[in-house]
């Protein structure tokens, strides 16, 4: 399939001119090479017309161009002075000769219709109103009005001022007059639809002496927009229908043949094709809204129509608006999983792609919430704080970098199942969707910390181990502090990796974090996980709380496991009160509902990363003289 | 057909009004459909406001809803803008445009402009 897009049909009159955009891929290549237009004929062949390399054809001179737009991957084709032998079939395209990728477009041009002279054009789009002025002479201004629609034969009445109304124009057409000007009458016909189209004729007073004036109604139906996404980006359609429709209920279709299926609409309908991946925001009190769809696939190109309608439904003679969607095969985003699983007890890492480009961007994690409207809270992100009911068990590492973050849940529950966003403050178009599925736990997990019941004593020497099975063997160990800006990684020492690499004894595979001594500041949640490089495996949470030393007694560590665990060797230590910027108020709520969620994260002003950003290991260190960490406070 | 000559226009600050005026000569002001046009240094021309013959249909762009206010007055042969909130986007030479036929104003006429200068 190729991957240009453009208009496939463009109609026009005689006289006027055209403007035709397509779009191509995003790579340099394209960016450079030849742009095209071309006529299709009888044969097959496309003669070129126009191109980028400076040809004009004799037909088109003066009076077309064509411009490459490489920061958007448009080219823009224009024609002017019309005439209807320009009507065919064309294609642009991409490449050296014009067999290269290219989209069909048919263009009509059609004659100016014959209309009487001193024809008042009105042209209006579906669904909206106009008002007819029917200018009379002041001697006719006690006679009767009237505004009829012409026919093959006859003029059929549409309204008159006797207050007769053709039903078809019941409750939508008023006459009337404006204040005391004696020399116009006015009707208004509101929801207009195709039908309404065509030649009226205003008459005040009868026979000879009466005032006649001649009315052409155009109802367009609206250009539909192009949109030219690439395959798992996301798209906005923005909606904007009016002050009149401000109150009535919203929706989203696609065109399917002769109807348009709702995809979703304010009174809580959506399709199931879309779910975990759909949101619907009412903008303002002026009747815009706008549908956010992430993850797209290729399934999702089409003609889409949004409107406003008290039923949520499509209705002939409302507002639209329509727009042709384009999925680019050929996408930047990467091929991730779209369903992540993981068990009871257990946990998840999430790679959550970004534009490469954009490495300083903030990048966020919500959970798509299918109640109401649909809408995002944030749950994490580098300058929001975790929501506290994720306390201890969810975390965002702004890293491996280039392209990709991790979030990490643990301590998973079934009620963790669902769909879960990852996007930044930047490029909207790199919004993903996640699914998250959990099932119930049939097995021990594989990292198990010891002792359960962590209660360090304050001041004295703590130690917790974290055991890992054989497999985890050549993967980098590690322990963090968590706190709700992040997870910290901390010194550690691997008793297993000690061990020749020929046998794995399954039961002395363990990673010890000692605290030494024991500080107030220490009591909290400590994960302990598994990485290969920067790619995160999976993790497990411990609470270690911090109590006072009981009198006449000594704290004696309570397992055998802990009488195994080896000191670590003298490290570079980091402190775990790491300086962090204040978690700044995110601007701008909206589909992400309360003051914690994000609507247009584009829009936001790009912001440098706090510096100590979530799951960096680069806080203040220092180093320490004993054989054990010190946390210094 | 009809003649037509803006003006009003000059430099203001941003946040700052104006009004331009388009005066209509040599036919019947009423015939035509009346509206506003603009071209910014190095850009099309693009529409801002128009009225229908007798007032009754206005339009206006998207970028100056709600600050833009266009009427007319056929016993004076005058069509008329308010701009109010000016942003340093407005700044263009203002062209006002007659149609014997169509709103939409096309613009079978035209004015030979006034310039408007919007500074921050």
């Known amino acids: 399939k190729s991957p240009i897009f453009g208009p496939q049909e463009v109609s026009s009159i005689e006289g006027d001119s055209v403007s035709i955009t397509c779009y191509y891929p995003d790579t340099s290549v394209n960016r450079h090479t030849r742009k095209y237009w071309c006529r299709q004929g009888a044969s097959g062949m496309c003669t070129t017309l126009i191109s980028s390399n400076g040809y004009l054809s004799k037909e088109y001179s003066g009076r077309a161009n064509l411009i490459n737009f490489p920061e958007n991957n448009t080219f823009v084709i224009n024609i002017e002075q019309l005439t209807q032998d320009d009507t065919g079939s064309y294609k642009c395209g991409l490449g050296t000769s014009n067999r290269g990728l290219s989209f069909d477009v048919s263009l009509e041009v059609s004659q100016v219709p014959e209309l009487p002279s001193d024809t008042h054009v009105y042209t209006k789009d579906i669904g909206r109103n106009v008002t007819i002025e029917c200018p009379f002479k002041r001697e006719n201004a006690p006679s009767k009005k009237s505004l009829c629609k012409k026919t093959n034969q006859s003029c059929e009445l549409v309204i008159d001022s006797t207050e007769k109304v053709n039903p078809s124009y019941i409750g939508r057409a008023k006459l009337f007059m404006k204040g005391t000007d004696l020399t116009v009458f006015y009707v208004n016909i509101s929801h207009l639809t195709h039908n309404d189209a065509g030649l009226y004729i205003c008459q005040a007073g009868e026979g000879p002496s009466a005032d006649k004036k001649n009315v052409d109604l155009q109802v367009l139906a609206p250009e539909p927009e192009l949109l030219y996404k690439d395959l798992r980006s996301s798209v906005t359609f923005e909606c904007d229908l009016g002050r009149e429709v401000a109150n009535e209920a919203k929706y989203l279709c696609r065109m399917n043949k002769e109807t348009c299926d709702v995809i979703i609409n304010t009174l809580g309908k959506r399709d199931p094709d879309f779910e975990g991946r759909i949101l619907i925001t009412p903008k303002d009190d002026n009747g815009r809204f706008s549908v956010l769809i992430t993850g797209l696939r290729k399934e999702d190109a089409g003609h889409y129509q949004c409107g406003a309608h008290s039923s949520g439904l499509p209705q002939e003679g409302w507002p639209i608006q329509t727009w042709q969607l384009f999925v680019n095969e050929e996408s930047t985003i990467p091929n991730r999983r779209s369903v992540v699983k993981g068990v009871t007890g257990g946990s998840v890492a999430i790679a959550c792609p970004y534009n490469p480009k954009e490495s300083s961007s903030l990048k966020y994690w919500c959970r798509w919430e299918g109640d109401g409207n649909g809408h995002c809270p944030v749950l994490v992100g580098t300058q929001a704080q975790v929501q506290e009911e994720y306390e201890g068990r969810l975390a965002l590492f702004d890293q491996p970098g280039n392209g990709t973050y991790t979030v990490i849940l643990n301590q998973l529950t079934t009620e963790d199942a669902g769909f879960y966003w990852c996007l930044t403050n930047g490029d909207s178009r790199w919004r993903t969707t996640i699914e998250l599925q959990v099932a119930e736990a049939t097995r021990e997990p594989n990292l198990e910390v010891t002792p359960q019941n962590a209660t360090a004593v304050l001041g004295e020497t703590f130690t917790v181990s974290c055991h890992y099975p054989c497999k985890f063997y050549s993967q980098e160990k590690y322990w963090c502090k968590w706190s709700n800006k992040g997870c910290h990684i901390l010194p550690s020492h691997d008793e297993g990796a000690r061990q020749s690499s020929v046998s794995c004894d399954q039961s002395s595979q363990l990673v010890s974090m000692t605290l030494n001594p024991v500080s107030k500041e220490d009591e909290g949640w400590y994960w302990c996980g598994v990485k290969q490089g920067q790619t995160y495996g999976e993790t497990t949470a411990i609470y270690i709380a911090v109590e006072e030393r009981t009198r006449g007694s000594s704290h004696v560590n309570p397992t055998d496991a802990n009488a195994r665990a080896k000191v670590a060797l003298e490290e570079e230590v980091v402190d775990s009160s790491i300086s962090e910027k204040e978690n700044k108020a995110i601007p701008n709520p909206g589909p992400f509902a309360n003051e914690r969620e994000i609507q247009n994260v584009g829009d936001q002003a790009q912001e440098n990363r706090a510096s100590g950003d979530a799951g960096s290991a680069d806080g203040q260190s220092r180093s320490s003289s004993s054989k054990h960490h010190h946390h210094h406070h | 057909q009809v003649q037509l000559v803006e003006s009003g226009g000059g430099l203001v600050q941003a946040g700052d009004s104006l009004a331009l005026s388009c005066a209509g000569s040599?036919?019947?002001?009423?015939?035509?459909?009346m509206g506003w046009f603009r071209q910014a240094p190095g850009k099309e021309r693009e529409f801002v406001a128009d009225?229908?013959?007798?007032?009754?249909?206005?339009g206006y762009a998207d970028s100056v809803k709600g600050r833009f206010t266009i009427s007319r007055d056929n016993a004076k042969n005058m069509v008329t803008l308010r701009m109010n909130s000016l942003k340093p986007e407005d700044t263009a030479v203002y062209y006002c445009?007659?149609?014997?036929?169509?709103?939409?104003?096309?613009?079978?006429?035209w004015g030979q402009g006034t310039q408007v200068t919007v500074s921050s």
């Open positions: 009225i229908s013959w007798y007032g009754a249909n206005i």
């Open positions: 445009a007659a149609d014997r036929n169509h709103w939409p104003v096309k613009g079978d006429y």
């Open positions: 040599g036919d019947t002001f009423s015939n035509y459909a």
